[in-house]
Amino acid sequence: IWELKKDVYVVELDWYPDAPGEMVVLTCDTPEEDGITWTLDQSSEVLGSGKTLTIQVKEFGDAGQYTCHKGGEVLSHSLLLLHKKEDGIWSTDILKDQKEPKNKTFLRCEAKNYSGRFTCWWLTTISTDLTFSVKSSRGSSDPQGVTCGAATLSAERVRGDNKEYEYSVECQEDSACPAAEESLPIEVMVDAVHKLKYENYTSSFFIRDIIKPDPPKNLQLKPLKNSRQVEVSWEYPDTWSTPHSYFSLTFCVQVQGKSKREKKDRVFTDKTSATVICRKNASISVRAQDRYYSSSWSEWASVPCS
């Protein structure tokens, strides 16, 4: 058993049929010694008496809010949550496996630049009685600070018969050095509580590996005289790290016909312009990637040829 926060405790249980469970000793937070009784949750039924109460915790019916009283007055509370371990593996019932980039990916994180700011998100089908708490650091043995905000519900989607809820959190490394080579990874830890079930999820990464630039901005077409060619120009996204001479991007320019079956013409360039042939009803799209490190491409920025 360990304390998650004040008056909230997590009991770690090996979860198998007829498991003996854990014996947990609760102590009433009071100078009183006599006449103390205990109740569980909303029940008025007395569970036991004494300044300390030993309980056998082996299933969710044994978790909940234990309250000690004296003469009708509440003295203190202890909320017990369960963390299940089945066949040596901690349960992952609360979050959905996103399976990207690999199986057992529950947390996904992205950064728009090298400033030390990043966003993580996760998915669940649970809509109520759900809380999240996020902590992060760079390194784990001598951790350097990363500050995370509160997790918020960022999207709702219908997937077949189920509703899916996306939560996200923004974090910022306290003393980020954008140009420095990373040697220690960022660690992100999410505590998830659904009713009386506790679970924790972790992710470890280097900022350089989760970079995904915003799409190029101000995408414009300039027709070239007496030609089907156009000059496409764009700018670095505002969110990208500066100076651009150091934090450089490379770009992919694509001409795509109206039909998905039509052949795509692609051009790669380090410049912020390119000359392409603009076909009727086609569109021109541009996306960006870090020039020197193959992390994710941005989403496309697009304009119609017409």
Partner: nanobody, 114 residues
Framework: EVQLVESGGGLVQPGGSLRLSCAAS????????MYWLRQAPGKGLEWVST???????AYAEFVKGRFTISRDNAKNTLYLQMNNLKPEDTALYYC????????RGQGTQVTVSS
């Protein structure tokens, strides 16, 4: 009519073990929290242990891992396995349907003495 009948008490040496049983009838046993209480000579009624409907137990401080409460809903029976008994465990042990012992049996005597 609610009936609770305890058995299994007796004379035992310090460090010995006993298993108390309580046969319940006249109510839906599986729907109630059940209790073991005790009364030492010249003392008031003292709570020993509780078992919830879900089967999880709670114990008084003096028990310190020596006793185990259990229930068999199919047999309408409550149990208290008592190990490493001490002279101070000498008392009349009652099975009860409430913490105050307003609905309880006649009790079974446990004497721990060398």
């Amino acid at each position: 009519e609610v009936q609770l009948v305890e058995s299994g008490g007796g004379l035992v040496q310090p460090g010995g073990s006993l298993r108390l049983s309580c046969a319940a009838s006249g109510f839906t046993f599986s729907g109630y929290w059940m209790y073991w209480l005790r009364q030492a000579p010249g003392k008031g009624l003292e709570w020993v242990s509780t078992i919830k409907t879900t089967g999880g137990g709670a114990y008084a401080e003096f028990v310190k891992g020596r006793f185990t409460i259990s229930r068999d809903n199919a047999k309408n029976t409550l149990y208290l396995q008592m190990n490493n008994l001490k002279p101070e465990d000498t008392a009349l042990y009652y099975c009860a349907r409430d913490f105050e012992g307003t609905v309880r049996g006649q009790g079974t005597q446990v004497t721990v003495s060398s």
